[in-house]
């Protein structure tokens, strides 16, 4: 019998690398059978999750899998970080792994880029 | 609805200038990458240049000198005046927001350069 | 300067074939590559940024891999509304802070219906 509990499928120690200025839209898939549980997404601080409010999110459907994806528009150097999204399902909060977002600065010509943004 | 429109193609004589628009809706276009890119008829894409989320413009060699990009926050519409223009230039050139993430494009403007 | 070279340069596949696309970079560009699909009079389409990573609204039958110099783009069971021509993006530039004397773009691979 399948399970009927929530899942976040966001893979451990994943990451995307992104131009600052860029549109971007991070996913967080979802899976649950008949109610569609209430999801949020938090960005780390330290070992702290701040709830991000006020940001635009919505939901896409694939198949047996929903997405509910945050909205950059665009990518700020300041969404640099570790970002997470958390159910709540039957009273009890699911939290999924922690996804990184790595922005990149678009350079000037004279500027030279570190060996991290290099490889990244 | 989001997009993006070219305009101010046209014919124009060898060693003439033109003045494209890219006029933004649905978004602000100061907060994005903006990528121009050609496509002469018949052959692939070329890059031109693009203008970064805080202004600066960076240019292929070909356009270096000639071209430049500009942005009218005001008008939520980017420029591209095109100077000494070459028979070669004759293309459709598009704009395009985002560098990486390029997700939306406008229909393009066709520059023909012939005496 | 960076250039990309990009085969084959046409290809002709049944509905249904597996289809593989080849772009080189002359020196490593990490995965700063898109891949673009473009029809006859249209706006290219983006389908794959960051080498690997399907854009929004993009069918799972497109995929991209590789890094460094070495990339791959891929349609698993060619459909007849994929007929069109498909780029390869080096977006290497933005994060180099330099601009190359090369187009950043490959030459394109049109790709048909047998």
């Known amino acids: 019998k399948e399970s009927c509990d929530v899942q976040l499928y966001i893979k451990r120690q994943s990451y995307h690398s992104i131009f600052a200025g860029d549109p971007f839209k991070l996913e967080c898939p979802v899976k649950y059978c008949a109610h569609r549980p209430q999801v949020t997404w938090c960005k780390l601080n330290g070992t702290t999750c701040v709830k991000l409010e006020g940001r635009h999110t919505s939901w896409k459907q694939e198949k047996n899998l929903s997405f509910f994806i945050l909205h950059f528009e665009p990518v700020l150097p300041s969404d640099n970080g570790s970002y997470r999204c958390s159910a709540n399902f039957l009273s009890a909060i699911i939290e999924s792994h922690s996804t990184t977002l790595y922005v990149t600065d678009v350079k000037s010509a004279s500027e030279r880029p570190s060996k991290d943004e290099m490889a990244s | 609805e989001v997009q993006l429109v070219e305009s101010g193609g046209g014919l124009v004589q060898p060693g003439g200038s033109l003045r494209l628009s890219c006029a933004a809706s649905?978004?602000?276009?100061?907060?994005?990458?903006i990528q121009w890119v050609r496509q002469a008829p018949g052959k692939g894409l070329e890059w031109v240049g693009f203008?970064?989320?805080?202004?600066?413009?960076y240019y292929a060699s070909r356009a270096k000198g000639r071209f430049t990009i500009s942005r009218d926050d005001s008008k939520n519409s980017l420029y591209l005046q095109m100077n000494s223009l070459k028979t070669e230039d004759t293309a459709v050139y598009y704009c395009a927001r985002g560098l990486s993430n390029s997700d939306l494009w406008g229909q393009g403007t066709l520059v023909t350069v012939s005496s | 300067d960076i250039q990309m070279t990009q085969s084959p340069s046409s290809l002709s596949a049944s509905v249904g074939d597996r289809v593989t696309i080849t772009c080189q970079a002359s020196?490593?560009?990490?995965?700063?590559l898109s891949w673009y699909q473009q029809k006859p009079g249209k706006a290219p389409k983006l389908l794959i940024y960051r080498a690997s990573t399907l854009a929004s609204g993009v069918p799972s039958r497109f995929s991209g891999s590789g890094s460094g110099t070495d990339f791959t783009f891929t349609i698993s069971s060619l459909q007849p509304e994929d007929i069109a021509t498909y780029y390869c993006q080096s977006t290497y530039g933005g994060v180099v802070g330099s601009t190359s004397d090369d187009n950043p773009f490959g030459g394109g691979t049109k790709v048909e219906i047998k």
């Open positions: 203008i970064n989320y805080g202004g600066s413009a």
């Open positions: 649905g978004f602000d276009i100061s907060k994005y990458n």
């Open positions: 020196q490593s560009i990490s995965s700063w």
